[in-house]
């Protein structure tokens, strides 16, 4: 089978600070040395890129400085964290993995993680 399987949790609840973390694991059909991981958000039929990072196997993921994502890698497993989430960001987040090098190229698409975000209640004014 030439398909690459990607596994990710079905549901994750973001913290009260708007942070959500989940693991994206892929079954590599080959010995990849350079991997690109992309987090996509699917709303209705629209798919948008949330963040992306390319890393060499054995090294850390490097997201752009202004990215809302951070992550670490260990073998064929990537631990992803998305920050700054608000209730309106609730949705399906898909982990996409591409084995860029060496040939052949492989694409893996996860089934998506439904991330639920609940905005914290504002603190009531105190009478002190």
């Amino acid at each position: 089978c030439k398909a690459m399987h990607v596994a990710q949790p079905a549901v994750v609840l973001a913290s009260s600070r708007g942070i959500a973390s989940f693991v994206c694991e892929y079954a590599s059909p080959g010995k990849a040395t350079e991997v690109r991981v992309t987090v996509l958000r699917q709303a209705d039929s629209q798919v948008t890129e949330v963040c992306a990072a390319t890393y060499m196997m054995g090294n850390e993921l490097t997201f752009l400085d202004d990215s809302i994502c951070t992550g670490t890698s260990s073998g064929n497993q990537v631990n992803l964290t998305i920050q700054g989430l608000r209730a309106m960001d609730t949705g399906l987040y898909i982990c996409k993995v591409e084995l860029m090098y060496p040939p052949p190229y492989y694409l893996g698409i996860g089934n998506g993680t439904q991330i639920y975000v609940i905005d914290p209640e504002p603190c009531p004014d105190s009478d002190f």
Epitope: A3, E49, A52, K96, Y106, L107, I109
Partner: antibody
């Protein structure tokens, strides 16, 4: 408007060279992989070449390996295909196509005709 | 290389009828990585179905895809005049990216 527009096709003699261009607009070009696909007259679709987001990784069909070179300029939102040592069997309409976020080729140009004949 | 074989090569159908197109892969293709395209004469291909069964944006619901592993199907439930065209399947899960040879759907 989200679109791809190819240019650079034409008539060239066997052994000659041609450079195709594909101008992208209406989307963040650097966030997508890109491909060239060709179609010989009356025939089916044949994938030709792939280039990664930053242009670091390139793949080619065996039929063009060593003769064609794919490249991109993200600052100019442009994709290129340098075709050398052209053969009669390279005669085709050449399409540039965007590799969608989920993988399929979700946006195609209108195509540019390349004819290799003496 | 994954070879995709489409059948039949030509399908003659009357408008309003159902059309069923087949695509068979030489080895297993994950269902997330199989697409169908429509091409009309003188035009570029247009994405219809991706992930074996998901309709692309703007594609009418008379088009549906199914299948997994090595056998995939594109079904057009009621053929409209504008549906007469050539249809290609494609796998995009690994390089080299490959297309089937196409099925021409013509008016009976």
């Amino acid at each position: 408007e989200v679109q791809l527009v190819e240019s650079g096709g034409g008539l060239v003699k066997p052994g000659g060279s041609l450079r195709l261009s594909c101008a992208a607009s209406g989307f963040t070009f650097s966030s997508y992989t890109m491909h060239w696909v060709r179609q010989a007259p009356g025939k089916g679709l044949e994938w030709v070449s792939f280039i990664s987001y930053d242009g670091n990784y390139k793949y080619y069909a065996d039929s063009v390996k060593g003769r064609f070179t794919i490249s991109r300029d993200n600052a100019k939102n442009s994709l290129y295909l340098q075709m050398n040592s052209l053969r009669a069997e390279d005669t085709a309409v050449y399409y540039c196509a965007r590799g969608g976020h989920l993988g399929p080729f979700d946006l195609w140009g209108q195509g540019t005709m390349v004819t290799v004949s003496s | 290389e994954i070879v995709l074989t489409q059948s039949p090569a030509t399908l003659s159908v009357s408008p309003g009828e159902r059309a069923t197109l087949s695509c068979r892969a030489s080895q297993s293709v994950g269902s997330s990585y199989l697409a169908w395209y429509q091409q009309k004469p003188g035009q570029a291909p247009r994405l219809l179905i991706y992930g074996a069964s998901s309709r692309a944006t703007g594609i009418p619901d008379r088009f549906s895809g199914s299948g997994s592993g090595t056998d995939f199907t594109l079904t057009i439930s009621r053929l409209e005049p504008e549906d007469f065209a050539v249809y290609y399947c494609q796998q995009y899960g690994s390089s080299p990216w490959t297309f089937g040879q196409g099925t021409k759907v013509e008016i009976k």
